[in-house]
């Protein structure tokens, strides 16, 4: 049975040219995590794996650094990096686990957090 | 199509050395964790290396340790075994295999394989 | 002598429901997946099975795969004469960083 819950960085915005912290956090199980995909729409970002460390995909290779921790960091952001991106948790042996983050790049200089949420 | 096509494989004499290839196809390789696996005539499946997406985490069955040394070549879609210090025993079928984007899943694309015979 | 532990042989008639049993150790398939592949005379292995239970898509649902423990298993059902093939399980092994396979299963429709 799947008792985990992943907590994630929410709805944010950031400004252009700026960068951002993606970060989920997977609690409520004893579940060992084997990898974390992050993907943005159907699209590859980056995996940390348990035993081989990360990959970030070729087209994100020099806007996207991994960590802190399991998290993402997005670098110098573009209007057209707005939206969905999930955090997907490989578990043994709960199974899947997939977090969701909304990011909104704004041209002005009147970005700020949104609230944390929870998806069980 | 997603398709892997070894080659490099034939007759060597014991102590000799062999380099094999496995050209990748239809799918974006960098994200991939790879595997060379290999069969005796007759015998059953021998797990023989892995190699994570940039080459900088490998790992060896004990059989080919000190002797084998995989790599990859990214920017032609290659995934490569250097063969050193052949024994009869290693005279086999060689294949390449693609792993699942969670390596730890399974090998989800066989290529046909390469035959190896070390024999004086 | 390989990690996991498989019957050399099995086998069945046509629309007979066969299983294959694969055994290892706390280090592999207890607390990692297995995965199963199909070897046909003179081609390349094909998984069935990965992620312990799940099927790639083409390969029909009468396969299916379980875990209980150290113990993996292969059910077919409905059994045809071209499942007839050799079979392998396979894991990573956490304690060795490998992977390591069974030693593969000949099932014969009777």
């Known amino acids: 049975m799947m008792t985990g819950t992943i907590e994630t960085t929410g709805n944010i915005s950031a400004e252009k040219g700026g960068s951002i912290i993606l970060q989920c956090h997977l609690s409520s199980t004893t579940a060992q995590v084997t990898q974390v995909n992050w993907e943005q729409q159907d699209q590859l970002l980056a995996i940390c794996n348990a035993d081989l460390g990360w990959h970030i995909s070729p087209s994100f290779k020099d806007r996207v650094a991994p960590g802190p921790g399991l998290g993402l960091t997005l670098q110098s952001l573009t209007v057209n990096d707005t939206g969905e991106y999930f955090c997907i948790y490989h578990t043994y042996p709960d199974g899947t686990y997939t977090g969701r983050i909304f990011l909104e790049v704004l041209e002005s200089s009147v970005a700020e957090h949104g609230a944390r949420f929870q998806i069980p | 199509e997603v398709q892997l096509l070894e080659s490099g494989g034939g007759l060597v004499q014991p102590g000799g050395s062999l380099r094999l290839s496995c050209a990748a196809s239809g799918f974006t390789f960098d994200d991939y964790v790879m595997s060379w696996v290999r069969q005796a005539p007759g015998k059953g499946l021998e797990w023989v290396s892995l190699?994570?997406?940039?080459?900088?985490?490998?790992y060896y069955a004990d059989s080919v340790k000190g002797r084998f040394t995989i790599s990859r070549d990214n920017s032609k879609n290659t995934l490569y075994l250097q063969m050193n210090s052949l024994r009869a025993e290693d005279t086999a079928v060689y294949y390449c295999?693609?792993?699942?984007?969670?390596?730890?899943?399974?090998?989800?694309?066989w290529g046909q394989g390469t035959t190896v015979t070390v024999s004086s | 002598q390989s990690v996991l532990t498989q019957p050399l042989s099995a086998s069945g008639t046509p629309g007979q429901r066969v299983t294959i049993s694969c055994s290892g150790v706390?280090?592999?398939?207890?607390?990692?997946?297995v995965s199963w592949y199909q070897q046909l005379p003179g081609t390349a292995p094909k998984l069935l099975i990965y992620?312990?239970?799940q099927r790639p898509s083409g390969v029909p649902d009468r396969f299916s795969g379980s875990k209980s423990g150290t113990s993996a298993s292969l059910a077919i059902s409905g059994l045809q004469s071209e499942d007839e093939a050799d079979y392998y399980c396979?894991?990573?092994?956490?304690?060795?960083?490998?992977?390591?396979f069974g030693g593969g299963t000949k099932l014969t429709v009777l």
């Open positions: 396979t894991s990573w092994d956490d304690r060795l960083k490998s992977w390591v």
């Open positions: 190699i994570n997406w940039n080459g900088d985490k490998t």
């Open positions: 295999a693609r792993h699942w984007i969670v390596f730890q899943y399974g090998l989800d694309i």
């Open positions: 992620n312990s239970h």
């Open positions: 706390s280090s592999n398939i207890e607390i990692k997946y």
